[in-house]
């Protein structure tokens, strides 16, 4: 039985050429996560694996980092950034936990950032 | 190319242990995951688990109370140990790769099979 | 578990017809779908991973599609060797698990 939940950041904005921290927490489950996929859409991102580490799709390898944590950062921000992410949280034995992360980058440098969120 | 061969007893008592060993040839068995697969006659796949060098399991929670896997990097091998087995247990057993890319991006797709080995639970 | 569901189980078809395949997940499984083909006595052969994304050495005439729950796989132009057992599985959650299978036979 799934009994975790899983926090994000929620929706987010941010400037045109900064930068922006995608964070998601699972909590609730006693479950060993397994494998962390970061998704744009269905583009996958980064991968974060309990055996492998951490893996960056070539096409994203110049913008994206990984971390903080199992979060992502995403660099050099531009409008087509704009957009619906995923953390999908692969667990043993619980199963698949997904949080949803809206993104808005916007032209004005007088973009209101988010509360960024903290793993206590 | 990376190949793999199961090997084990084709007959087992019920209440006994079933033991199998894949040997994988031309590559290593080191960071990869590797998988257990079992197909009874005549019907569908159901995945036992899967392994990784560091000796991390993950089972299938239907069996995980009879599953035990095992990795020997030095034999380039792992192994499936399958206990108190019943006629239910009857069926041909795969060994797996689990083809790990940022394209696939997850576990569980299985690349590169073993041919299989049938194996009979019966007295 | 998530399960899947394929249809139909059986089907029967000529050399060079298209031959489609559905496949549908109990949940959500966005993209993780992947698909084999079994043919009687050998072991599954890895068709195509991410739902529609080729695996490497297999003909064009092998093609998938959709998201989410619901799935295709398409054979384009149905040759002699296609003749044979075709399973889904998903890989988005663990167990990995798999449909009951579609025989292609010849009509």
């Known amino acids: 039985m799934m009994t975790g939940t899983i926090e994000t950041t929620g929706n987010i904005s941010a400037e045109k050429g900064g930068s922006i921290i995608l964070q998601c927490h699972l909590s609730s489950t006693t479950a060993q996560v397994t494998q962390v996929n970061w998704e744009q859409q269905d583009q996958l991102l980064a991968i974060c694996n309990a055996d492998l580490g951490w893996h960056i799709s070539p096409s994203f390898k110049d913008r994206v980092a990984p971390g903080p944590g199992l979060g992502l950062t995403l660099q050099s921000l531009t409008v087509n950034d704009t957009g619906e992410y995923f953390c999908i949280y692969h667990t043993y034995p619980d199963g698949t936990y997904t949080g949803r992360i809206f993104l808005e980058v916007l032209e004005s440098s007088v973009a209101e950032h988010g509360a960024r969120f903290q793993i206590p | 190319q990376v190949q793999l061969q199961e090997s084990g007893p084709g007959l087992v008592k019920p209440s006994e242990t079933l033991f199998l060993t894949c040997t994988v040839s031309g590559g290593s068995v080191t960071n990869y995951y590797w998988s257990w697969i079992r197909q009874p006659a005549g019907k569908g796949l159901e995945w036992i688990g899967r392994?990784?060098?560091?000796?991390?399991?993950y089972y299938n929670p239907s069996l995980k109370s009879r599953v035990t896997m095992s990795l020997d990097t030095s034999k380039n091998q792992f192994s499936l140990r399958l206990s108190s087995v019943t006629a239910a247990d009857t069926a041909v057993y795969y060994c797996?790769?689990?083809?790990?890319?940022?394209?696939?991006?997850?576990?569980?797709?299985?690349?590169?099979w073993g041919q299989g080995t049938m194996v009979t639970v019966s007295s | 578990d998530i399960q899947m569901t394929q249809s139909p189980s059986s089907l029967s078809a000529s050399v060079g017809d298209r031959v489609t395949i559905t496949c549908r997940a109990s949940q959500s499984i966005r993209r993780y779908l992947n698909w084999y083909q079994q043919i009687p006595g050998k072991a599954p052969k890895f068709l195509i991973y991410d739902a529609s994304s080729l695996q490497s050495g297999v003909p064009s005439r092998f093609s998938g599609s959709g998201s989410g729950t619901d799935f295709t796989l398409t054979i384009s132009s149905l040759q002699p060797e296609d003749f044979a057992t075709y399973y889904c599985?998903?890989?988005?959650?663990?167990?990995?698990?798999f449909g009951q299978g579609t025989k292609v036979e010849i009509k």
């Open positions: 797996a790769r689990e083809g790990f890319t940022m394209v696939r991006g997850v576990m569980g797709a299985f690349d590169i």
């Open positions: 392994i990784y060098t560091s000796g991390s399991t």
């Open positions: 599985q998903q890989s988005y959650s663990t167990p990995p698990t």
